[in-house]
């Protein structure tokens, strides 16, 4: 069975920001604006064609 | 610091595990410099087909 | 047409290096992934690594990481693939091979292929 | 490292015979599948990628199948000019693996 949709789990660091407690509610500035720069991000670095997006966001502590 | 888990979704066929991995490491130093974002500990790994149905992309 | 040249037959003694050239035609040289792959007597193909020439970019088979060194020339449109501390079981033919443009994950041009012989 | 494993290693079969031969990946690789044909003495010949899709200038004999684990490259009329070693490989992850090859001859 082919949906046509491949799909990935990527996980990484980033080591110069501090997590906090507004980095588990969405409905903060810093979570938006850090959701807005890696959805961002990911589309340049994956601007040739066959990307479709990304989902499922989520911060924890490093 | 933080740790960032998401799901990325591609049509079909057009990248391998590997390419995903590679052209976001080769990112690593942009997104230092454009988002203020230090980027390591890089972990890419390909979602099994029940769980892929379930997850909307974007 | 696209051709993949690659240098001569070469001889060697343990321990010695031997670096091998793929010289491309026909076709941008930056914006093909350039890979090397060896193939033993009566041995399976054995994937080696690649090169990305537009950016520099390397990836190595870990099983040679330490002995293997992939590099380029773009103003002569050559890849190169320098194996150190050769030993007999490195007597095989080593092939370069273009990988397909973007989102081709095959090889469509390979060199002549090389052989290179270990032997004290 | 995803391992390859064709099947068989070799086989010997009669003109116009319709010949099989199978790879299985030790892990998922999804369609990234490729075939090449080498011939003695020759540099190997990309046949078959993304499982199957056939290579322009490729005869329509020759086709493939198959995802995940399991794949199946078909000639459904051998000819003469068939007689070579066949290899799969993986294109899903590094080490870029390749099975190791069946020999095709004719009886």
């Known amino acids: 069975l082919s949906t046509g949709v491949s799909f990935f789990f990527l996980s990484f660091h980033i080591s110069n920001l501090q997590f906090n407690s507004s980095l588990e509610d969405p409905s903060t500035d810093y979570y938006q604006e850090l959701q807005r720069d890696i959805s961002e991000m990911f589309l340049q670095i994956y601007k040739q064609g066959g990307f479709l997006g990304l989902s499922n966001i989520k911060f924890r502590p490093g | 610091s933080v740790v960032v888990q998401l799901t990325l979704a591609f049509r079909e066929g057009t990248i391998n595990v590997h390419d995903v991995e590679t052209q976001f490491n080769q990112y690593k130093t942009e997104a230092a410099s454009r988002y203020n974002l230090t980027i390591s500990d890089v972990s890419v790994s390909d979602v099994p087909f029940p769980f892929s149905a379930q997850s909307g992309a974007g | 047409q696209v051709q993949l040249v690659q240098s001569g037959a070469e001889v060697k003694k343990p321990g010695a290096s031997v670096k091998v050239s793929c010289k491309a035609s026909g076709y941008t040289f930056t914006t093909y992934t350039m890979h090397w792959v060896r193939q033993a007597p009566g041995q399976r193909l054995e994937w080696m690594g690649y090169?990305?020439?537009?950016?520099?970019?390397?990836h190595y088979n870990q099983k040679f990481k330490d002995r293997v060194t992939i590099t380029r020339d773009t103003s002569a449109s050559t890849a190169y693939m320098e194996l150190s501390s050769l030993r007999s079981e490195d007597t095989a033919v080593y092939y370069c091979a273009r990988q397909g443009n973007y989102a081709a994950y095959y090889f469509d041009y390979w060199g002549q292929g090389t052989l290179v012989t270990v032997s004290s | 490292d995803i391992q390859m494993t064709q099947s068989p290693s070799s086989l010997s079969a009669s003109v116009g015979d319709r010949v099989t031969i199978t790879c299985r990946a030790s892990?998922?690789?999804?369609?990234?599948l490729v075939w090449y044909q080498q011939k003695p003495g020759k540099v190997p010949k990309l046949l078959i990628y993304?499982?199957?899709t056939l290579t322009d200038g490729v005869p329509s004999r020759f086709s493939g199948s198959g995802s995940g684990t399991d794949f199946t490259l078909t000639i459904s009329s051998l000819q003469p000019e068939d007689v070579a070693t066949y290899y799969c490989?993986?294109?899903?992850?590094?080490?870029?693996?390749f099975g190791q090859g069946t020999k095709l001859e004719i009886k």
């Open positions: 993304n499982a199957k």
């Open positions: 892990g998922n690789i999804h369609n990234f």
């Open positions: 090169i990305n020439p537009g950016s520099d970019y390397t």
């Open positions: 490989q993986n294109f899903w992850n590094v080490p870029f693996t």
